[in-house]
């Protein structure tokens, strides 16, 4: 996250540190708690790493630092990848991870509600992005779980900005015209959330921009609300039924 | 598969013009910085130039500024590198690789996807 | 510019060797070195990127170490197939590879 400031503890207790365990261990992508067994992430997150013994989910924490061997972690029961998404394309940026085991809820740890199916009218005000990702462009991973608030821009606008892309109905978009705050590499996969009625809500997922936080050049989010179909479809038929935290 | 394939490459005289190109398949090209590196015989490699993935910033090496220009086509999925003025020391072989990306993940740095390279040889 | 110098140039080593090569750097450039593996007539091939992260599918016998300014490319049990030129890269300000460092057969 660039321009952002720390966390404090259960602010976001949604957020999830998706790592990978090789030789070493390191924070690869961010993610979002939507249910006792489900985290919602971005499909590039596993460009070449598919496996799912590889990686380890941690939830219910605010500094990576404080991650020890003795640290609990989940691990995957299945990853779940769009299937229009390519790695040659780049669009249907989402995947779905089942954790081997459900997860209790705590004040640190619970999930992030849905949006509706297609949302369109909501005009959203207050949106933040959260993540443990370089804090610029030639920056590394951040200890303490970083937040920024960032307007989201309309696709015409940010269509405007990626003349060379295309920036479909199924992203959303969002940044400051001058830059200074973004989202950055590690944050893919974390969330765009956005409160109101007092109410916070997964609208999107990080997934690219060129650069971070540069004049301009918005950040692009896969946009949850054309996803519901297929997340409620997924979930449920591996589950019996949604567990998921959609709006009343 | 993800793939670079150069071409281009041959023999030309000193002050001579070149056009290399890279083809590249298997992964978002548009998403992605794109790289020229070159090993002249018995050295080591250098990089030579580089270019954002929209394009719109380009950075070159000083030993080939204001000789060589690259520039990409994303929907042709093609990099390529023009070559001005050539001189005998421009005599490698230029290798295409893939740079960090647009994406956000923590994958980022080295060039991870490189061509097998396509010899230039400038000589009288 | 940063420049990068690479030692030993050349070393000769045995099957089953613990194989150190270490790069510095003119001038700080963080965890934004990245270390290649090279043999004539293939495409150079990453290794390890960020100092110290292994790349996917590279055996684990290869780690990489260091930041600022010093850092250094082990190989814990050298292999056959290890035997090969290696280049570090500062990617922190635009990109510099360092001389190489071939790896010979003792």
């Known amino acids: 996250i660039v321009g952002g400031t720390n966390s404090s503890w259960g602010e976001w207790p949604w957020q999830v540190s998706l790592q990978v365990k090789l030789t070493a261990q390191r924070h690869l992508c961010g993610g979002s708690l939507i249910g006792h067994q489900w985290v919602l992430t971005a499909a590039h997150c596993f460009d070449g790493l598919p496996l799912q013994d590889v990686w380890r989910i941690y939830s219910g924490i605010l500094n990576l630092s404080d991650i020890t061997k003795d640290t609990p972690f989940s691990q995957i029961k299945e990853i779940i990848i769009h299937q229009n998404y390519k790695v040659s394309e780049g669009n249907h940026d989402i995947a779905l991870i089942k954790l081997q085991a459900p997860l209790n809820y705590t004040e640190f740890q619970k999930p992030i509600c849905l949006p509706s199916k297609g949302d369109t009218s909501t005009i959203y005000t207050n949106c933040w992005v959260t993540g443990w990702g370089f804090s610029k462009e030639k920056g590394e991973i951040q200890n303490i779980l970083q937040k920024v608030n960032i307007p989201l821009v309309t696709n015409e606008e940010c269509q405007k900005r990626y003349q060379d892309y295309k920036i479909t109905q199924r992203m959303v978009c969002a940044g400051y015209k001058e830059g200074g705050k973004d989202a950055c590499k590690g944050d893919s996969g974390g969330p765009l959330v956005c409160k109101h009625n007092g109410m916070w809500r997964l609208v999107g997922i990080t997934s690219w921009g060129e650069g971070c936080a540069r004049r301009e050049q918005p950040g692009v989010y896969t946009k949850v609300a054309e996803y519901m179909d297929w997340i409620l479809e997924k979930t449920q038929s591996s589950d019996g039924k949604a567990q998921m935290q959609s709006p009343a | 598969e993800v793939q670079l394939l150069e071409s281009g490459g041959g023999l030309v005289q000193p002050g001579g013009s070149l056009r290399l190109s890279c083809a590249a398949s298997g992964f978002t090209f548009s998403f992605y910085n794109m790289n020229w590196v070159r090993q002249a015989p018995g050295k080591g490699l250098e990089w030579v130039s580089s270019?954002?993935?929209?394009?719109?910033?380009?950075n070159y090496a000083d030993s080939v500024k204001g000789r060589f220009t690259i520039s990409r086509d994303n929907s042709k999925n093609t990099l390529y590198l023009q070559m001005n003025s050539l001189r005998a020391e421009d005599t490698a072989v230029y290798y295409c690789?893939?740079?960090?990306?647009?994406?956000?993940?923590?994958?980022?740095?080295?060039?991870?996807?490189w061509g097998l390279g396509t010899m230039v040889t400038v000589s009288s | 510019d940063i420049q990068m110098t690479q030692s030993p140039s050349s070393l000769s080593a045995s099957v089953g060797d613990r194989v150190t090569i270490t790069c510095r750097a003119s001038?700080?450039?963080?965890?934004?070195l990245n270390w290649y593996q090279h043999k004539p007539g293939k495409a150079p091939k990453l290794l390890i990127y960020?100092?110290?992260n292994l790349q996917f599918g590279v055996p684990s016998r290869f780690s990489g170490s260091g930041y600022g300014t010093d850092f250094t490319l082990t190989i814990s049990s050298l292999q056959p197939e290890d035997f090969a030129t290696y280049h570090c890269q500062q990617t922190f300000s635009l990109f510099t590879f360092g001389g190489g460092t071939k790896v010979e057969i003792k």
């Open positions: 001038q700080s450039i963080s965890v934004y």
């Open positions: 270019i954002s993935p929209s394009g719109g910033e380009t």
């Open positions: 960020g100092a110290s």
């Open positions: 690789a893939r740079g960090g990306g647009a994406y956000r993940n923590n994958w980022w740095g080295g060039f991870d996807i």
